[in-house]
């Protein structure tokens, strides 16, 4: 028999990834970051 459709078996949390660049002044350059679910991780 064919299998019925189900997910992978692992819970998936859908989150928004936001890349941003922020200018912090001419003598410090820029910060480039990655925000996942509201938390800056890089």
């Amino acid at each position: 028999d064919a299998e019925f459709r189900h997910d992978s078996g692992y819970e998936v949390h859908h989150q928004k990834l936001v890349f941003f660049a922020e200018d912090v002044g001419s003598n410090k350059g820029a910060i480039i970051g990655l925000m996942v679910g509201g938390v800056v991780i890089a």
């Epitope: 028999d1 299998e3 019925f4 459709r5 189900h6 997910d7 992978s8 078996g9 998936v12």
Partner: antibody, heavy 123, light 109 residues
């Protein structure tokens, strides 16, 4: 809250096509992971799964009836349809539709059912 | 899906046990077992009690418990109440065709 309601012709003759409609509210088939299926129950007997349709139009049928069954949906109107061709007296039953989600938050089981619609096939 | 017994006479307060056996394993390739239990009361549509073998659906009393693996599964009701009477169906959602057991009628002695 989630509700489903089936509607059909009530009575039809052998060899005709049975058209059923499941109208629902409280969820949307445009939501990833959502699906609706059909189940039937002859009076005083057990339950038989017929077909299921997912939000992305993926469809599954009971192989023993597949040549007779067509499931479809109208996402904007919150409706799912089942057609059974060439009906016979053995297709006399109460027909239920039920929601079944695919992802964890939707339980991945038939968590809400309609009240059922009675169909009689008689000459 | 083979369900036993087909009829189960009980007294209120008794423990009740219903067995369901599949002819082949219903473990899905994702590792989950899609074995469910539904209760149908007279004149009503079926209602979900247990899914994925042992997880109670929201609002289901903890006197209901599901267990088993592979091909053999059990539904237990620890203390039967009047509102528990009806027909219990096991159901497998792992393989096509999805199939129900024949049902077990829980009734008063």
């Amino acid at each position: 809250q989630v509700t489903l309601k089936e509607s059909g012709p009530g009575i039809l003759k052998p060899s005709q096509t049975l058209s059923l409609t499941c109208s629902f509210s409280g969820f949307s088939l445009s939501t990833a992971g959502m699906g609706v299926g059909w189940i039937r129950q002859p009076s005083g007997k057990g339950l038989e799964w017929l077909a299921h349709i997912w939000w992305d139009d993926d469809k599954y049928y009971n192989p023993s009836l597949k040549s007779q069954l067509t499931i479809s949906k109208d996402t904007s109107r919150n409706q799912v349809f089942l057609k059974i061709t060439s009906v016979d007296t053995a297709d006399t039953a109460t027909y239920y539709c039920a929601r079944r989600g695919l992802y964890y938050g939707n339980y991945d089981a038939m968590d809400y059912w309609g009240q059922g619609t009675s169909v009689t096939v008689s000459s | 899906m083979t369900q036993t017994p087909l009829s189960l006479p009980v007294s209120l307060g008794d423990q009740a046990s219903i067995s369901c056996r599949s002819s082949q394993s219903i473990v899905h390739s994702n590792g989950n077992t899609y074995l469910e239990w539904y209760l149908q009361k007279p004149g009503q549509s079926p209602k979900l009690l247990i899914y994925k073998v042992s997880t109670r659906f929201s609002g289901v009393p903890d006197r209901f418990s599901g267990s088993g693996s592979g091909t053999d599964f059990t539904l237990k009701i620890s203390r039967v109440e009047a509102e528990d009477l009806g027909v219990y169906y096991c159901f497998q959602g792992s393989r096509v065709p999805l199939t129900f057991g024949a049902g077990t009628k829980l009734e008063l002695k």
